[in-house]
C-alpha cells in the first residue's frame, strides 16, 4: 500500500480579496515525512506552505496538523491577489537527509477573479464639427480571467469598434482591454452620449459603463443673421443680429459701424434649444437722423475661439 495524495478539486475560482481553501488529503500517515505545498512545477516551483513551525503570511492549515491521525493537509489562502493565480501541488516527502519527494497530488489550478476597473472613455483633444469623424477610446484594466466583452453604444444604438485588444496575449495574472470606435458627429449630438460597456464574469450581469458626453467633443457653429425691424419712430432703426444653434456657449458679439467697433456684447441670457444648442439675439438701435449717408453695420460673431463670422447690413441714409 502506497501513500496517495488526493487533491479533489482540479480548479478553484476565487475573487481577489477573498480567501480560498485548497484541499489535500493523504491515504496514509506513512512514511514519516513532511507535507509541503508548492505553486508550479520543476526547479522554479515556489514553496507556499510547509506543515512545520515556519510561518507563512496569508496561508494557514485548515486542520490540526499536529494531531497524530490527521490526514487533512488542506490550506487556506487569505486575501487572494491576482499574483496568487497558478497551479498548486500538495507534495508528500519521506524524512531523510535530505527529505525525498515521494508523491504529489494532481494539482489544483487557482483562478483569481479580479474585477475590471471602471471603463474610462477618452475622446479627441479638440472639438469636432458636424460630419467630422472622431475616435473614442475605452480602457479598462486589472481583470482576470482574460475573457471579457466590450460593447459601444451611441444613444442606445450599438456601434462597431475599429479595434479591440486585450493585453497581454499570453497567460498573465491580470489583463487590460483597449477599444477604439469611430463616431460621425452631427449637429444634433450635443445631448448624445457614447457609452463603453464592459461585461465580465466578476460583475454578476451588471456591466460597468464608461460614458463620454459628446457635448465635450463637439462644436456647432452658429448661423448668423442680421435683420432690420420696422422703425418704431421716424428717426430710429432697430437692427437684430441672431446667432442660432451654436455650442458650446462661448460667444462674443461685436457691432461695427462702417468698420469701426461700436459695441461689444458678452452674452449672458442665452436661450437653450431642446437639442442642447443655444441661440442669442442682440438688438442694436440706430439713430437714423444722425446718418445722412448710407451706413454699413456689421455683426461680428466669434464662437469658441474660431474665426469670426460676419454679417453686414446697410442702413440707407436719410
Amino acid at each position: 500500500t502506497e501513500v496517495k495524495v488526493i487533491q479533489p478539486e482540479k480548479s478553484v475560482s476565487v475573487a481577489a480579496g477573498d480567501s480560498t481553501v485548497l484541499n489535500c488529503t493523504l491515504t496514509s500517515l506513512l512514511p514519516v515525512g513532511p507535507i509541503r505545498w508548492y505553486r508550479g512545477v520543476g526547479q522554479s516551483r515556489q514553496l507556499i506552505y510547509s506543515f512545520t513551525t515556519e510561518h507563512f503570511p496569508r496561508v494557514t492549515n485548515v486542520s490540526d496538523a499536529t494531531k497524530r491521525s490527521n490526514l487533512d493537509f488542506s490550506i487556506r489562502i487569505s486575501n487572494v491577489t491576482p499574483e496568487d493565480a497558478g497551479t498548486y501541488y500538495c507534495v508528500k516527502f519521506q524524512r531523510g537527509s535530505p527529505d525525498t519527494e515521494i508523491q504529489s497530488g494532481g494539482g489544483t489550478e487557482v483562478y483569481v477573479l479580479a474585477k475590471p476597473s471602471p471603463p474610462e472613455v477618452s475622446g479627441p483633444a479638440d472639438r469636432g464639427i458636424p460630419d467630422q469623424k472622431v475616435n473614442f477610446t475605452c480602457k479598462s484594466h486589472g481583470f482576470s480571467p482574460r475573457n471579457i466583452t466590450l460593447k459601444w453604444f451611441k444613444d442606445g444604438q450599438e456601434l462597431h469598434p475599429l479595434e479591440t485588444t486585450v493585453n497581454p496575449s499570453g497567460k498573465n495574472v491580470s489583463y487590460n482591454i483597449s477599444s477604439t470606435v469611430r463616431v460621425v458627429l452631427n449637429s444634433m449630438d450635443v445631448n448624445s452620449k457614447v457609452i463603453c460597456e464592459v461585461a465580465h464574469i466578476t460583475l454578476d450581469r451588471s456591466p460597468l459603463r464608461g460614458i463620454a458626453n459628446l457635448s465635450n467633443f463637439i462644436r456647432v457653429s452658429p448661423t448668423v443673421k442680421v435683420t432690420q425691424q420696422s422703425p418704431t419712430s421716424m428717426n430710429q432703426v432697430n437692427l437684430t443680429c441672431r446667432a442660432e444653434r451654436f455650442y458650446p456657449e462661448d460667444l462674443q458679439l461685436i457691432w461695427l459701424e462702417n468698420g469701426n467697433v461700436s459695441r461689444n456684447d458678452t452674452p449672458k441670457n442665452l436661450t437653450k434649444n431642446t437639442d442642447g444648442t443655444y441661440n442669442y439675439t442682440s438688438l442694436f438701435l440706430v439713430n437714423s437722423s444722425a446718418h445722412r449717408e448710407d451706413v454699413v453695420f456689421t455683426c461680428q460673431v466669434k464662437h469658441d475661439q474660431q474665426p469670426a463670422i460676419t454679417r453686414n447690413h446697410t442702413v440707407l441714409g436719410f
Epitope: T27, S28, L29, L30, S63, K67, R68, S69, N70, S74
Partner: antibody
Framework: QVQLQESGPGLVKPSQTLSLTCTVS??????????WSWIRQHPGKGLEWIGA???????YYNPSLKSRVTISVDTSKNQFSLKLSSVTAADTAVYYC???????????WGQGTTVTVSS | DIQMTQSPSSLSASVGDRVTITCQAS??????LNWYQQKPGKAPKLLIY???NLETGVPSRFSGSGSGTDFTFTISSLQPEDIATYYC?????????FGGGTKVEIK
C-alpha cells in the same frame, strides 16, 4: 461527556437504500480535531470500518463500499449520517457510529443499531 | 488494504493468568495501532491507543507494545470481567482495518 445515538429503520428491503443517523450530544460535531466514523459488524463476525468524516471537511470511505456509500454531516442538527445504496442480505449487520478521541483511537461509540436486509 | 492478522482467534485462561494476544500487520504501520474490547451485545471500547498508551480510566493490567508489523496486547492478570473479544485496529493507512478478533474465555 460526548454521547452518540444511532437511529434508522431496522428493516430494509433488498436493492433499497439504508439510511442511518448518528446524533451527537454533550459536544459539538464541528469542534476539535475528530473523525466521526461508521463501523459495522456482521452477525458473529469482526468489525468493518465503513468510512469517516473529518471535522475539517474531508470524507473518507472504505474502497470496498465506496460506490454505494455516502457520509454527510448536518452541523445545525449536530448529526452525521450514513447512506448505503443497493443493499443486499450481505449488508445485514449491527451499525455503529463512533468518535475519535483526542488521541487516535475511537473512544466514544453509539450502542449500535441492527439493520436487517430482507424482503 | 492492510491485513491485520490476530492470533489466537480464541483462548481460554484462568483468573489471574497472564494473557497475550498478537497482531501482525501486512506491512509496516509504525505505532499507528489501537486495541479494543467488545463484550457480548455491547459496542467496542478503546483500551490502548498508539500501540502502547493506556486510555484514561482503563485498568493498568492492560498493556500494549510493538512497532512496525508486530504488536502484542497483554492482560497481566485476567479478571472475570475481562471476558470479551479483543480487536486490534490500524490507522496508518486508509481504509482503517481491524484484526479478526480474539475471544477470551475463563477456564
Amino acid at each position: 461527556q460526548v454521547q452518540l445515538q444511532e437511529s434508522g429503520p431496522g428493516l430494509v428491503k433488498p436493492s433499497q437504500t439504508l439510511s442511518l443517523t448518528c446524533t451527537v450530544s454533550g459536544g459539538s460535531i464541528s469542534s476539535g480535531g475528530y473523525y466521526w466514523s461508521w463501523i459495522r459488524q456482521h452477525p458473529g463476525k469482526g468489525l468493518e470500518w465503513i468510512g469517516a468524516i473529518y471535522y475539517s471537511g474531508p470524507i473518507y470511505y472504505n474502497p470496498s463500499l465506496k460506490s454505494r456509500v455516502t457520509i454527510s454531516v448536518d452541523t445545525s442538527k449536530n448529526q452525521f449520517s450514513l447512506k448505503l445504496s443497493s443493499v443486499t442480505a450481505a449488508d445485514t449487520a449491527v451499525y455503529y457510529c463512533s468518535k475519535e478521541g483526542y488521541h487516535s483511537g475511537m473512544d466514544v461509540w453509539g450502542q449500535g443499531t441492527t439493520v436487517t436486509v430482507s424482503s | 488494504d492492510i491485513q491485520m492478522t490476530q492470533s489466537p482467534s480464541s483462548l481460554s485462561a484462568s483468573v489471574g493468568d497472564r494473557v497475550t494476544i498478537t497482531c501482525q500487520a501486512s506491512q509496516d504501520i509504525s505505532d499507528y495501532l489501537n486495541w479494543y474490547q467488545q463484550k457480548p451485545g455491547k459496542a467496542p471500547k478503546l483500551l490502548i491507543y498508539d500501540a502502547d498508551n493506556l486510555e484514561t480510566g482503563v485498568p493498568s493490567r492492560f498493556s500494549g507494545s510493538g512497532s512496525g508489523t508486530d504488536f502484542t496486547f497483554t492482560i497481566s492478570s485476567l479478571q472475570p470481567e475481562d471476558i470479551a473479544t479483543y480487536y486490534c485496529q490500524q490507522f496508518a493507512y486508509l481504509p482503517w482495518t481491524f484484526g479478526g478478533g480474539t475471544k477470551v474465555e475463563i477456564k
